[in-house]
Each structure stands twice: as structure tokens, then as C-alpha cells.
Amino acid sequence: DSEEDEEHTIITDTELPPLKLMHSFCAFKADDGPCKAIMKRFFFNIFTRQCEEFIYGGCEGNQNRFESLEECKKMCTRDNANRIIKTTLQQEKPDFCFLEEDPGICRGYITRYFYNNQTKQCERFKYGGCLGNMNNFETLEECKNICEDGPNGFQVDNYGTQLNAVNNSLTPQSTKVPSLFEFHGPSWCLTPADRGLCRANENRFYYNSVIGKCRPFKYSGCGGNENNFTSKQECLRACKKGFIQRISKGGLIKTKRKRKKQRVKIAYEEIFVKNM
């Protein structure tokens, strides 16, 4: 089917945020199963970070399959910005501050911080590099700013303002937006190339975060980590700028991206995860 559709995409001058999902099945590849029915279903695409349509065969498959776009969005996406702004202005912590620390299903372990609701403090844990949840911060300071109570009953919100616990008045502080909104690529893009454990010599690409470029490497065929792409284009899309077009003045623009409708089984680059 060569029918094409045009898709409007919001483009920002910043990189994509880390991928943090509530459910690990949202990372599964779309699976039409072995049967031959033609059923319209929806799945969450970890590369575009959107719920998209696919054709389901009617049997087997996996949990990344939803009857409606709304159900898919409900299970696999979060309106993070709105949720944070809303809860902060109500002088509450964002709800994700109360989630248990979640290392995710990958194994490129890196230091992150989470808010421990029992101790009421931000603490260190080891994050596997993909999925997990939003109670996951790159710095102790960012975690404290978003989830910890400030001194004297003040709660610091995410736009550099303090909420006065007594009369709810807003006191301007720093105008710096915290790094939750300083979008950057998926955290697995920071992991080193990992050949894996097998003996094949497959041509793959990984994102070198030091030089900011995608570079080739030889993949053994199994294991490794998610910083592993079958093409340079896919590597750049996931780790460099995605569908991002740099614009000198920053801000938002709309661009058009043409994409063929897919009527066959979706085949992504392999994503290497720990066995569930």
C-alpha cells in the first residue's frame, strides 16, 4: 500500500526527554501475531513516542495492543507537563514523587535519584537506562526541587517559584526551568557501545555522547544494550535530534513529515532488554 499521509509534528529546539513509561509492555514491538485477520489496533511506538495504528492478525501477539487510541495513550503516555504544573499550583507534589524507584528493564545501569516518600528525602538508585517511571532524576538537586518540601513549609515548584504554605502566594525565584524540561535524548544514548556476548559481526551504529555523533560498531548478535541501531539514520533519530530541525530563535515550529501507512508487521530496531 503506497498511500501516503501527512503528519504534523511539533518540533522544538531541544532534544527528546528520557523515555519513562508506566508499563514495560509499552516498549514491546507491535506484534500482529500468526493469524490472518485484519483488525485495526493501536500500539505505543517507543521511537516516535506516540500511539500508532497497526494491523493485528487476531491471535497471540503481546500486551502492547489496544482497542483504541485513547486506551493506548492512557496506558503508555503521560501528560507530564500539565500534570506537574497542575499539582504544583495546588501545592502538592507531582504524583510521580510517590512512585517506587524503578530501575526499568534494561541493564545500562547509571546513577539516578528518586524521592523516597518514607524518608521524605531524595535518594540515589541505579537506573537501567530505559523505561522506569518519572520518579527518576539526573541530579539530587532536580529531585529535591520537584519532590522535596522546601524549608519553612515552602514547596518549590518547577518554574522557579515558591509557594507560600500560609497564603499560597507566589514568590518569584530563579527563572531557570529545571532540567525535567531541558529535554534530551533517551538515557540509553549515554551508554557505551556494547558488542554483546555472541560471535556474530553485524554492522550496527551507536550514539557516541562524547562527540555527539553516531558511529559504527560490530555487534555480536545478542545481549548488549539499547544503544544499538541498524542504521545511522535510526541512531540519529533516536539520540541526536529525532525529527528535530534546529531553528536559530528556538521556540516551536510545525513541520510536515511524510510517512507511508504500514500494513505489514512493524519491524523496529532490536531493543535489548533484560528478560521479563
Epitope: E101, D102, T111, N116, Q118, R124, K126, L140
Partner: antibody, heavy 118, light 112 residues
């Protein structure tokens, strides 16, 4: 005073199973990630597994992944290690340890000896 | 995995004299957050391990100040300014920067 008391060790044949327990007291158990570390006779220490505060998520050493399962019951202030398909090389004293806010082990139990032998 | 190498493996010392144990890691222990998660444990004969020092140089509560930790990157040192009888045992360095956590082979401190 923080106290961690392990139990459940003993002699088991290769391929057998054993379940270790660690009873915690003197601190709010549910506030801390917990770990198991082992020490083979006359040898050094080896990290085995860690579990998050609420018990939903786990980490394992490659040497035990797929064979050992760490779990916890916060209501009972208890940590567990279910060990299946045991091998001679799993023979060791097993310690439970608490993880502090830096994700570092700060308090250790007295250990329980697991011997895998035919 | 990060390999931790301690020297010496055996350290006979005279009571009241200083002692020094070296610990080297196969890669830097400086984490992305700017902290270095290098720690020292003491295991007295027949006892379980006890944490002495964390984050290179911070002493745990109740640890005598004759113990000091220092170092950065890949090279670290534990010093005992004046060895006492109760200091006899095995000392382990271990790193909590990279996963999995790994330990040194241990240094046995004994009285001459």
C-alpha cells in the same frame, strides 16, 4: 539499634533449593532498599542481589540471575532469598545488608551458611 | 565489571604503629553525579562485615578517628594512624559507583 538476622541456611544437594530469610529491626524497613551479599569459605565478598524499597523491582548478579529470587515483606520486616538450582559454587555465608540513601550497604547481618554438596 | 585490587593482602603491624592499605580500581569510580562511591569494610575474626568509611573519606558513626580514607579516581588508601588490638581483621574496599558492586580481595591485618 539496627539489627539484621539471617536464617534458613543449611546443607543442600546440587540442584536443590533453599530459602533464606532476614529479619530486620531497629529501623523503618520499608524505607530502605535491601541486598544479599555472599562470602565463600576463605574467600572475598560477592554482591548477589538488591531489591527496591517497595519490593517491586530487583537487581541480580549474572552468576545467580534466573536461579535466585529476592523478595521482601514490608509488613513483616523481612527480606528473602529463594535459591533454586543450587551449585557447589553457591556455597557461602550469605549476608543481608541495608542500602542507605546513597545506595550503599551500611549495615550487615551476621550471616547464614549455605553448603551445597552431594 | 570493575575489578578492585588491594595491596598488600597481608599486613603484619606493631601495636601503636601506623598501617596503610591500597585499593585500585580498574576504572574511575567518579560517578556522573560528581561523587566517588568507594567504601571500606572491616571484618573482625568470626564477625560479619562492618562499614568503616563511605564516599572515600566519610567515617561511619562510632568509627575511631584513627581511621582515615583518601584517594580519587582509581587509587585509594585506608590508613590507621596507630594500630590497636581491636583493629585485627580483614579490610575490604568496595565500589558502589558501577553496577554490579564489586569488592577487593581483602587485606588481613594482624599483630606482629
Amino acid at each position: 539499634e539496627v539489627q539484621l538476622v539471617e536464617s534458613g541456611g543449611g546443607l543442600v544437594k546440587p540442584g536443590g533449593s533453599l530459602r533464606l530469610s532476614c529479619a530486620a529491626s531497629g529501623f523503618t524497613f520499608s524505607s530502605y532498599a535491601m541486598s544479599w551479599v555472599r562470602q565463600a569459605p576463605g574467600k572475598g565478598l560477592e554482591w548477589v542481589s538488591t531489591i527496591t524499597t517497595g519490593g517491586s523491582y530487583t537487581y541480580y548478579a549474572d552468576s545467580v540471575e534466573g536461579r535466585f529470587t529476592i523478595s521482601r515483606d514490608n509488613a513483616k520486616n523481612s527480606l528473602y532469598l529463594q535459591m533454586n538450582s543450587l551449585r557447589a559454587e553457591d556455597t557461602a555465608v550469605y549476608y543481608c545488608a541495608r542500602q542507605d540513601g546513597n545506595f550503599l550497604m551500611d549495615y550487615w547481618g551476621q550471616g547464614t551458611l549455605v553448603t551445597v554438596s552431594s | 565489571d570493575v575489578v578492585m585490587t588491594q595491596t598488600p593482602l597481608s599486613l603484619p603491624v606493631t601495636l601503636g604503629q601506623p598501617a596503610s592499605i591500597s585499593c585500585k580500581s580498574s576504572q574511575s569510580l567518579l560517578d556522573l553525579d560528581g561523587k566517588t562511591y568507594l567504601n571500606w569494610l572491616q571484618q573482625r575474626p568470626g564477625q560479619s562485615p562492618k562499614r568503616l568509611i563511605y564516599l572515600v573519606s566519610k567515617l561511619d558513626s562510632g568509627v575511631p578517628d584513627r581511621f582515615t580514607g583518601s584517594g580519587s579516581g582509581t587509587d585509594f588508601t585506608l590508613k590507621i594512624s596507630r594500630v590497636e588490638a581491636e583493629d585485627v581483621g580483614v579490610y575490604y574496599c568496595w565500589q558502589g559507583t558501577h553496577f554490579p558492586f564489586t569488592f577487593g580481595q581483602g587485606t588481613k591485618v594482624e599483630i606482629k
